[in-house]
């Protein structure tokens, strides 16, 4: 039978001779050279050679366990003379013994990692991993221990896991953002003689909101013309924040100051500036300087950092209002004046006043905008603003005159303003009442006395305060012996009544009645109107049947016998 055990061979042999592996030996071998040993399998004849007489095996080359840890070969022993095996062919193993010839190698040459600034001590940053090709099952050749070569006191590494953690309290990104940490991985459990490898870990502190906004100056001054409309930007202020991104966002607000109601501050989200704007109309003549207290604050802070103090700062903003040459200002937004329609030319109606609001108080001159008074009915004293008539008025033609008066600074004609003037023409009784329409009526031949044949209405262009009160009567020249009477109804109407029984159209076909209409105002106005009454044949119901044709073309005027 074969007489050997498993062969062990140290890797990386550096001797000048071949490395002895071991001896194949059969108990049939009497040492007389009658047996021949043959080797086959992994590396036989190349890596491994055998002395066919003695069975001694040698390795011809340096072996690397990490390349191949085990070789499987077959051994034969044959009788030289007969060529027959004296032992059955048998498999055997050459196991390569590990030596510590490999250093730990990190999975990355360079690691990058981030950790928030101000993190608690022991905050996880990143885990590094090194692997060692040596045999982990034998000795400590592959037992890796991590240590920090560079990066203390800021960071530490767990020796067994390679977990890097923060090691220093209150690491501040604003002081230092980048750290280069060098980690060593050493085998042999870190003992002397162990092999080592290193890696670089580039650690960046990420920003947290640990800094408040700060104004670079305590006072700002801006100027703005008093004419600036609401919404006008008048200046920009900017607080700076050592943080970045979201943590450097700033909101601005006005917290105090006499200009609290007069100005606004808007946050420009692009530039993180505060834009001071006009909120209400300014007036240099009322107030020339405003002060504001403006606050810049971070809108968001992680509550755990609130202990670092108020995340806001304030500055004083002084705003100087600049005088602007303003147009004159009238004492009223509009003027309403009244004048009687019978006013003589050059009658003063009233006056307007305008003043230059500026400190200079420039004198003003007045004029009428002729586009609004084409007929030049009114005029104005350019010096004192008195309005007077330059033509006669008629209320019945135009009740209201709407004109525009212009006030212009004498020293600066570009500065002018306008005001509407509403002039009401007051009524004077200068129109007589008259018939509301042309009256032409008829009377039946068989009419009875005191029969109403027509109701009369009157109109008057005037507009008396207490209303119209008309009176009606027959003209004096027609009153005596008239065939008709006028009955005044005392309600601004009158009736024409028959005065006799029966009329004869052959005797008198047409009557012309002159009627006097008077008003009750001062001075009394009256007019005479003529009513034409034709005599007609009627049926028994009083319906007209026929009248003389000439009555239709009879000239108006006074007729005898009416």
């Amino acid at each position: 039978s074969w007489m050997w055990n498993q062969f062990f061979l140290l890797e990386e042999y550096t001797g000048s001779d071949y490395q002895y592996v071991g001896k194949l030996h059969s108990d049939q071998d009497r040492g007389d050279g009658s047996l021949k040993y043959i080797l086959s399998g992994d590396g036989a004849g190349d890596l491994f050679i055998i002395n066919e007489n003695t069975g001694d095996i040698q390795a011809t080359k340096r072996l690397d366990r990490e390349e191949k840890p085990v070789y499987i070969l077959r051994a034969q022993a044959i009788n030289r003379r007969t060529g027959r095996p004296v032992e059955p062919e048998s498999e055997f193993i050459i196991k390569i013994h590990d030596i510590n010839d490999n250093e730990p190698i990190f999975t990355k040459e360079v690691y990058t990692a981030t950790v928030p600034e101000m993190s608690d001590v022991g905050t996880f940053v990143v885990q590094v991993t090194a692997t060692d090709a040596d045999d982990p099952t034998y000795g400590n050749s592959a037992k890796v221990v991590y240590s920090i070569l560079q990066g203390q006191p800021y960071f530490s590494v767990e020796s067994e896991t390679g977990i890097i953690k923060t090691a220093l309290l209150n690491m501040d990104r604003e002081n230092r953002e980048q750290y280069q940490v060098v980690i060593q991985a050493k085998d042999m459990g870190g003992q002397m003689g162990g092999l080592s490898g290193t890696t670089t870990v580039n650690i960046t502190l990420t920003d947290v909101n640990d800094n408040p906004p700060r104004f670079p100056q305590s006072t700002y001054q801006f100027k703005t013309p008093e004419s600036s409309p609401p919404g006008t930007p008048i200046g920009r202020i900017k607080a700076s924040d050592a943080d970045v991104g979201e943590n450097a966002e700033i909101e601005y607000s006005i917290t105090d100051g006499e200009g609290l109601d007069m100005f606004d501050v808007i946050t420009d989200q692009e530039t993180q500036e505060g834009i001071i704007t006009v909120k209400k109309l300014l007036d240099f003549e009322k107030k020339k300087v405003y002060t504001l207290k403006v606050e810049a604050s971070n809108p968001y802070v992680e509550p755990r950092f609130l202990y670092l103090g108020p995340f806001k700062d304030s500055a004083t903003v002084r705003i100087v209002v600049e005088d602007v040459d303003e147009p004159p200002v009238f004492s009223k937004l509009a003027y309403i004046l009244q004048i009687r329609e019978d006013a003589q030319i050059n009658t003063t109606i009233g006056s307007v006043t305008a003043q230059d609001p500026d400190a200079a108080r420039n004198p003003v001159k007045y004029s009428v905008d002729r586009h609004t008074d084409m007929d030049r009915i009114f005029n104005i004293d350019s010096g004192n603003g008195s309005i007077f008539t330059s033509k006669l008025l008629d209320r019945e033609t135009l009740l209201w005159h709407n004109i525009t008066v212009i006030a212009t600074e004498i020293n600066n004609p570009k500065q002018s303003s306008r005001v509407p003037l509403y002039i009401k023409v007051l009524d004077v009784n200068d129109n007589a009442p008259e018939f509301a329409e042309f009256y032409e009526t008829f009377v039946c031949e068989k009419a009875k006395a005191d029969q109403l044949i027509q109701t009369l209405h009157a109109v008057d262009k005037d507009d008396p305060y207490s209303g119209h009160q008309f009176s009606f009567s027959l003209a004096p020249e027609a009153a005596s012996g008239s065939n008709f009477t006028i009955q005044d109804n005392k309600d601004n109407t009158a009736g024409i009544l028959t005065r006799k029984n029966g009329y004869n159209r052959h005797e008198m076909s047409t009557y012309l009645l002159p009627v006097v209409i008077s008003d009750n105002d001062y001075p009394v106005q009256s007019s005479t109107g003529t009513v034409t009454v034709r005599v007609c044949a009627c049926d028994h119901h009083g319906n007209m049947q026929s009248c003389h044709a000439e009555a239709l073309i009879h000239p108006t005027g006074l007729s005898t016998g009416a």
Partner: antibody, heavy 121, light 107 residues
Framework: EVQLQESGPGLVRPSQSLSLSCSVT????????WGWIRRFPGNKMEWMGY???????SYNPSLQSRISITRDTSKNQFFLQLNSVTAEDTATYYC???????????????WGPGASVTVSS | DVQMTHSPSYLAASPGESVSISCKTS??????LVWYQQKPGEAYKLLIY???TLQSGTPSRFSGSGSGTDFTLTIRSLEPEDFGLYFC?????????FGSGTKLEIK
């Protein structure tokens, strides 16, 4: 009252990018903070990140390397992109508004109804 | 990260009863805690912020208490519409973290 509505594909292939939109009505996204939160099967919730009223972003460190939140103020929308997704990203995704409750703190006070996303091949 | 632990995870109660839900945190978060409610088919609703301040529109039967690491949501005299999922969230530090929730069901 503000309303939020998520939209996007319900199925995403592994290793691809997940993209969701959030449309906001009756409120401008140029005020307050606008974020994304997800709920995994089993009810575990995770804050993913937000975009501020002026466009700055803040992300959960666990997602920092593959998340992006952007916005389109003209459309009053904001967006989530999550790259290199795996089955572990299967969740219901919610867009939300955070308002300032004083003391520098922002609290989620309005949520969208949620969009269910499955990562599967 | 701040760990949030809810208890119980499931709770059954009848209308009219009072219930309390607990939320514990792994570190002191002062009072920077909110409570949310979710009812099936509805969006999440903010109930309480700053540990105990009721959000506008939250009925007065809800109350929040606690500070530091131990917080409680109490609902007095349950109404039928109160059943659903409740969970807490801290906003003391980033990343903001949530509890896994308590499911409140009708007994």
């Amino acid at each position: 009252e503000v309303q939020l509505q998520e939209s996007g594909p319900g199925l995403v292939r592994p290793s691809q990018s997940l993209s969701l939109s959030c449309s906001v009505t009756d409120y401008s996204i140029t005020s307050n903070y606008w974020g994304w939160i997800r709920r995994f099967p089993g009810n575990k919730m995770e804050w993913m990140g937000y975009i501020t009223y002026s466009g700055y972003t803040s992300y959960n460190p666990s997602l920092q390397s593959r998340i992006s939140i952007t916005r389109d103020t003209s459309k009053n929308q904001f967006f989530l992109q999550l790259n290199s997704v795996t089955a572990e990203d299967t969740a219901t995704y919610y867009c939300a508004r955070s308002i300032n409750h004083g003391g520098y703190s922002y609290v989620v006070d309005a949520w969208g109804p949620g969009a269910s996303v499955t990562v599967s091949s | 990260d701040v760990q949030m632990t809810h208890s119980p995870s499931y709770l059954a109660a009848s209308p009219g009863e009072s219930v309390s839900i607990s939320c514990k945190t792994s570190k002191n978060i002062s009072n920077y805690l909110v409570w949310y409610q979710q009812k099936p088919g509805e969006a999440y609703k903010l109930l309480i912020y700053s540990g105990s301040t009721l959000q506008s529109g939250t009925p007065s039967r809800f109350s929040g208490s606690g500070s530091g690491t131990d917080f409680t949501l109490t609902i007095r005299s349950l109404e039928p519409e109160d059943f659903g999922l409740y969970f807490c969230q801290q906003y003391y530090e980033k990343p903001f973290t949530f509890g896994s929730g308590t499911k409140l069901e009708i007994k």
